[in-house]
């Protein structure tokens, strides 16, 4: 069920559940902002201060990266 | 070098429990998060359940959810799985394995096998 | 979850000779990681990140791939390949690996 996720706990979470797409502690804003300042919602407020699901911490993931022959 | 032992396979009748350990060496454990892994007989690789370095966090796949409970205890150097309601299909060889970031499944103890048969 | 389909299920291919292992997900991934296991032995990280062989792995081995498809190729196979080769996917939850490959000697 949902938990809280701190520090370590939290890293390991992102680094396990996004695995190679990796994770941003913060949501990605669009280059559109008004202002530098703008508020943006973090994993650590929605995972540490509240608890987390699964779900939620999945929103943190990167995107895929773009596919190309190695 | 890093060393996962893992114990406590054997045969057991559906519907029983069963509990597994792995001891851990070589690394400090409490840094790392830790999984299970299971292989059927003749079968593939099938990842069990997930715990965070401090314990505080796990995930478990979704045929082994509300049975099965992941565990470590950091002052010993070990993992547990514990497992509960036994079915056949729980029939495999179980292998706990250290995941490096970008290194997946970096590393594995020997595994035990359990068997799940009236 | 993501499906791994690994094709063939088995191959015998002789000694010096090329075997080629595809691995087919059920939606894109990033990378595509490989293991070899033998009998009565844990499995090995073999290639790591589509294409980066593990430490140890000769450089007979290769892999390459994109989106959906992947593949790990033995140039000249030598007897100490013959084993059982599984595909792993790491992007997205939960990890999933393929059915394996068994590679013999012909």
């Known amino acids: 069920g949902p938990e809280t996720l701190c520090g370590a706990e939290l890293v390991d979470a992102l680094q396990f559940v996004c695995g190679d797409r990796g994770f941003y502690f913060n949501k990605p804003t669009g280059y559109g902002s008004s202002s530098r300042r703008a508020p943006q919602t973090g994993i650590v407020d929605e995972c540490c201060f509240r608890s987390c699901d699964l779900r939620r911490l999945e929103m943190y993931c990167a995107p895929l990266k773009p596919a190309k022959s190695a | 070098q890093v060393q996962l032992v893992e114990s406590g396979g054997g045969v057991v009748q559906p519907g029983r429990s069963l509990r597994l350990s792995c001891a851990a060496s070589?690394?400090?454990?409490?840094?790392?998060?830790m999984t299970w892994v299971r292989q059927a007989p003749g079968k593939g690789l099938e990842w069990v359940a997930y715990i965070s370095s401090g314990g505080g966090s796990t995930y478990y796949r979704d045929s082994v959810k509300g049975r099965f409970t992941i565990s470590r205890d950091n002052s010993k150097n070990t993992l547990y799985l514990q497992m509960n309601s036994l079915r056949a299909e729980d029939t495999a060889v179980y292998y706990c394995?250290?995941?490096?970031?970008?290194?997946?499944?970096?590393?594995w103890g020997q595994g035990t096998l359990v068997t799940v048969s009236s | 979850d993501i499906v791994m389909t690994q094709s063939p299920d088995s191959l015998a291919v002789s000694l010096g000779e090329r075997a080629t292992i595809t691995c087919r997900a059920s939606s894109s991934v990033s990378y595509m990681h490989w293991f070899q296991q033998k009998p009565g032995q844990s499995p090995k990280p073999w290639i790591y990140?589509?294409?980066k062989l593990a430490s140890g792995v000769p450089d007979r081995f290769s892999g390459s791939g994109s989106g959906t498809s992947y593949s790990l190729t033995i140039s000249s196979l030598q007897a100490e390949d013959a084993a059982t080769y599984y595909c792993l996917q790491r992007s997205s939850y939960p990890p999933t690996f393929g059915q394996g490959t068994k590679v013999e000697i012909k």
């Open positions: 070589g690394f400090t454990f409490s840094n790392y998060y």
């Open positions: 394995a250290r995941e490096d970031y970008g290194y997946w499944f970096a590393y």
């Open positions: 990140g589509t294409s």
